[in-house]
């Protein structure tokens, strides 16, 4: 079986989401994602990131906040907040560019 490509040093992160296979994961960086779907309470997920680091730079909205960090278990005790309610012209999931 071919060896997976090297991604540089991996970091161990806290993993807390319905899709975690265990209490920690390994990735290129650690993540915390706070998401509020319409009509539901916000949910905070912790895990690992390997793709699309640009999401780490997106500004918080009333629906989502992404946080990334690069050291051992750095996402363990991070708590995020969402922005205050936006004006009606602004939409969830807007482009991060």
């Amino acid at each position: 079986d071919p060896v997976k490509p090297s991604r540089g040093p991996l970091v161990t992160c806290t993993c807390e989401s319905p899709h975690c296979r265990g209490p920690t994961c390994q990735g290129a960086w650690c993540t915390v994602v706070l998401v509020r779907e319409e009509g539901r309470h916000p949910q905070e997920h912790r895990g690992c990131g390997n793709l699309h680091r640009e999401l780490c730079r997106g500004r918080p909205t009333e629906f989502v906040n992404h946080y990334c960090c690069d050291s051992h278990l750095c996402n363990r005790n991070v708590s995020l907040v969402l922005e205050a309610t936006q004006t009606p012209s602004e939409q969830p999931g807007t482009d991060s560019q």
Partner: antibody, heavy 118, light 108 residues
Framework: QVQLQESGPGLVKPSQTLSLTCTVS??????????WNWIRQHPGKGLEWIGY???????YYNPSLKSRVTISVATSKNQFSLKLSSVTAADTAVYYC??????????WGQGTLVTVSS | EIVLTQSPGTLSLSPGERATLSCRAS???????LAWYQQKPGQAPRLLIY???SRATGIPDRFSGSGSGTDFTLTISRLEPEDFALYYC?????????FGQGTRLEIK
């Protein structure tokens, strides 16, 4: 086995909005490991990336299409959708949805041809 | 935006021969995020290689990828009849997802 299936009108009139939905089966769209992409291919031409959405609703779009594109996600339905506004004949293409993993775009829909014509 | 340029545009070879397809990036890209796809008429693209050199699940070992920086290569060691198709390289995993314009591999 993960499967993606595009659906939507095959014919759209010029100046109107093209709307397509991708339904994912055999896997959860809410997994943080994957990003959900739209790609198109004009007849006889190469592949053009349109944009992606993450389960959180965060999006990124091809700069050349950004002003006309909206991608949204419905995690409860395991679907994500594409809207492309103000279409012209130049938007006639086969539209694909695909899952992006660390290993690349590993699963694709079969594609749906959308023709823009009056 | 990273531009990927593939060469040659068309490659005419016979079954059993070795095929070498090139993909050049306009600026250095991480090998982690370089992939190759095969596309046959009327079908969606199929992932062949990811991370520049790792074969995707179920891909025969006659397909191999190599390269780094700006220059990447897809090699098919001994062409089988089913290998004649379109091939695309791709940069993924970043805000600049791009495809090369493709190389058509045709039977000589």
């Amino acid at each position: 086995q993960v499967q993606l299936q595009e659906s939507g009108p095959g014919l759209v009139k010029p100046s109107q909005t093209l709307s397509l939905t991708c339904t994912v089966s055999g896997g959860s769209i809410s997994s943080g490991d994957y990003y959900w992409n739209w790609i198109r291919q004009h007849p006889g031409k190469g592949l053009e990336w349109i944009g992606y959405i993450y389960y959180s609703g965060s999006t990124y779009y091809n700069p050349s299409l950004k002003s006309r594109v909206t991608i949204s996600v419905a995690t409860s339905k395991n679907q994500f959708s594409l809207k492309l506004s103000s279409v012209t004949a130049a938007d006639t293409a086969v539209y694909y949805c695909a899952r992006e993993a660390t290993e690349g775009f590993d699963y694709w829909g079969q594609g749906t041809l959308v023709t823009v014509s009056s | 935006e990273i531009v990927l340029t593939q060469s040659p545009g068309t490659l005419s070879l016979s079954p059993g021969e070795r095929a070498t397809l090139s993909c050049r990036a306009s600026q250095s890209v991480s090998t982690t995020y370089l992939a190759w796809y095969q596309q046959k008429p009327g079908q969606a693209p199929r992932l062949l290689i990811y991370g520049a050199s790792s074969r995707a699940t179920g891909i025969p070992d006659r397909f191999s990828g190599s390269g780094s920086g700006t220059d990447f290569t897809l090699t098919i060691s001994r062409l089988e009849p089913e290998d004649f198709a379109l091939y695309y390289c791709q940069h993924y995993g970043t805000s600049s997802i791009t495809f090369g314009q493709g190389t058509r591999l045709e039977i000589k």
